[in-house]
């Protein structure tokens, strides 16, 4: 069988402050079993954004129905984007174990945040 690949099709995404950002991620195989996690940044200081198996991530929702047994789409939407959310986001497949071990990472998607459009009031 072909080895699982993690595909993040977008190199970069630009979102206006206050809007939602959709970060796309698909995997090419359901095996090996293990959770998907999203991180901002790389290395030991990376920040966990979403963990498929546990945790409370109030600003994050999955784009597809993740409880489908055949689901391969692990795209997420992050609401109410602020400049502090800018960075590179990685979709990472883990392989089950004690503890789970990182198996394959996507190439990353750089999120940039545009200033919220200002509303000019015209007086007539």
């Amino acid at each position: 069988e072909e080895e699982l690949q993690v595909i993040q099709p977008d190199k970069s995404v630009s979102v206006a402050a206050g809007e939602s950002a959709i970060l796309h991620c698909t995997v090419t195989s359901l095996i090996p079993v293990g959770p998907i996690q999203w991180f901002r940044g790389a290395g030991p200081a990376r920040e966990l954004i979403y963990n498929q198996k546990e945790g409370h991530f109030p600003r994050v929702t999955t784009v597809s129905e993740s409880t489908k047994r055949e689901n391969m789409d692990f795209s997420i939407s992050i609401s109410n984007i602020t400049p502090a959310d800018a960075g590179t986001y990685y979709c990472v497949k883990f392989r089950k174990g004690s503890p789970d071990t990182e198996f394959k990472s996507g190439a990353g998607t750089e999120l940039s945040v545009r200033a919220k459009p200002s509303h000019h009031h015209h007086h007539h």
């Epitope: 359901l30 090996p32 409880t67 489908k68 047994r69 055949e70 089950k96 004690s98």
Partner: antibody, heavy 118, light 109 residues
């Protein structure tokens, strides 16, 4: 507290139909996949149906495929199992169970007994 | 017939350690769980995801895996642990939930 309460069991003749219900409370029902698991008298557990959280995708083992239909009404926090063309070997206690993120079971109902007999 | 294999019975004295094994699934495509069932009662989940214990389950119940075999270990067995124990799985390659045939744990004495 998570609660799952099954109902609808009873005695039915071979070839007959029955619909089981499972009322869920204590958690966000619409966020969890659900399953039905049965246990024949004196026998082990057997998974008979699963459904995704939104209800669009359903799963069955070969033993019941084409005869059983799992469905859900998220507005009523209720899971269903429609059983048609029932056979004597379908006699069992039927449990509804909540699924974990990886489709194992973490909470179970108390079960409802279905007896298929003439 | 059951897709997962576990011993039909295990006997242990109070205070001893009981181990129940389960095999039959592919490591790369399976997750396992352990369920306890006492006579006339519904199953209770003891372990899920091979080795995760729900918060309401005593610490004396633990799960481990080695290759294609998973093990339920009950340390310091108590009389109330006498029950049937089922190994259950989720098989990602077939989208199914196989079970083992169950193991009857007898607490001696």
């Amino acid at each position: 507290e998570v609660q799952l309460v099954e109902s609808g069991g009873g005695v039915v003749q071979p070839g007959g139909s029955l619909r089981l219900s499972c009322a869920a409370s204590g958690f966000t029902f619409s966020s969890n996949a659900m399953s039905w698991v049965r246990q024949a008298p004196g026998k082990g557990l057997e998974w008979v149906a699963g459904i995704s959280a939104g209800g669009s995708d359903t799963y069955y083992p070969a033993s019941v495929k084409g005869r059983f239909t799992i469905s859900r009404d998220n507005s009523k926090n209720t899971l269903y199992l429609q059983m048609n063309s029932l056979r004597a070997e379908d006699t069992a206690v039927y449990y509804c169970a909540r699924e974990t993120w990886n489709h194992l079971f973490d909470y179970w109902g108390q079960g409802t007994l279905v007896t298929v007999s003439s | 017939s059951y897709e997962l294999t576990q011993p039909p019975s295990v006997s242990v004295s109070p205070g001893q350690t009981a181990r129940i094994t389960c095999s039959g699934g592919s490591y790369s495509s399976y997750y396992y769980a352990w369920y306890q069932q006492k006579p006339g009662q519904a199953p209770v989940t003891l372990i899920y995801s091979d080795d995760k214990r729900p918060s309401n389950i005593p610490e004396r119940f633990s799960g481990s895996s080695s290759g294609t075999t998973v093990t339920l270990t009950i340390s310091g067995v108590q009389a109330e642990d006498e029950a049937d124990y089922y190994c259950g799985g989720y098989d990602q390659s077939s989208y199914t939930n196989p079970f083992g045939g169950g193991t009857k744990l007898t607490v001696l004495g």
